[in-house]
């Protein structure tokens, strides 16, 4: 018996605007109704939690309101976003997948996606 | 799946001894990172020390006084504590996460990595 496997893309790259979007998979090794998502960053030997949500399966994800994450799940996949990312956050972003319930609790963790964040060269000023 | 069970807390003398073990069912602990943590009342749980196949790791707290070590035959991960002081009074918890490649030292004992907690084992140390 193994860890449950959680797979995410290795790279990211957010956009101009702070917003990184990526996939976490994971494979249920059994009939999970109720999952837990926690989104972790590890940069400079410090891991910090990013953002957590738990839903029930078939049901959509609910962060908490002032979240920088928002998502939605597919079967035994969750589409996760994050935004008002900038370059201090650059790191990498790990998927963490707790199968709560029913009986027996799975953990897996996936092996992270480095995403990158490049601040937006200011506007140079405009004559017209 | 993994199931722990951990056992081994009581009361100490302060400078005395006493050492916790974590038993695995379920599954070799072979791809797992075991670590041991601990709460005192009105704190936060906070790492002891963590152990994967090749490495170990310990809180600043406990270094030289504490030793992780595991069996992977009999799936035992066992936390000997000497010279125990006051402050190391706590609930001890063991826990398991998945070994990943990107767990450094620093960071492979972080609490946010493990799952499978113990219902937790009291420590005292009073004279």
């Known amino acids: 018996c193994k860890a449950m496997h959680v797979a995410q893309p290795a790279v990211v790259l957010a956009s101009s605007r702070g917003i990184a979007s990526f996939v976490c998979e994971y494979a249920s090794p059994g009939k999970a109704t109720e999952v837990r998502v926690t989104v972790l960053r590890q940069a400079d030997s410090q891991v910090t939690e990013v953002c957590a949500a738990t839903y029930m399966m078939g049901n959509e994800l609910t962060f908490l309101d002032d979240s920088i994450c928002t998502g939605t799940s597919s079967g035994n996949q969750v589409n996760l976003t994050i935004q008002g990312l900038r370059a201090m956050d650059t790191g990498l972003y790990i998927c963490k997948v707790e199968l709560m319930y029913p009986p027996p609790y799975y953990l897996g963790i996936g092996n992270g996606t480095q995403i990158y964040v490049i601040d937006p060269e200011p506007c140079p000023d405009s004559d017209f | 799946e993994v199931q722990l069970v951990e056992s081994g807390g009581g009361l100490a003398q302060p400078g005395g001894s006493l050492r916790l073990s974590c038993a695995a069912s379920?599954?070799?602990?072979?791809?797992?990172?075991i670590g041991w943590f601990r709460q005192a009342p009105g704190k936060e749980r906070e790492t002891v020390a963590c152990?994967?196949?090749?490495?170990?790791s310990y809180a600043d707290s406990v270094k030289g006084r504490f030793t992780i070590s595991r069996d992977n035959a009999k799936n035992m991960v066992y936390l000997q504590m000497n010279s125990l002081k006051p402050e190391d009074t706590a609930v001890y918890y063991c826990?398991?996460?998945?070994?990943?490649?990107?767990?450094?030292?620093?960071?492979?004992?972080?609490?946010?990595?493990?799952?499978?907690w113990t219902q937790g084992t009291q420590v005292t140390v009073s004279s």
């Open positions: 379920g599954s070799t602990l072979d791809p797992f990172v």
């Open positions: 152990i994967n196949r090749s490495r170990t």
């Open positions: 826990a398991a996460s998945p070994d990943k490649p990107f767990y450094t030292d620093q960071t492979m004992c972080n609490k946010h990595y493990y799952g499978y």
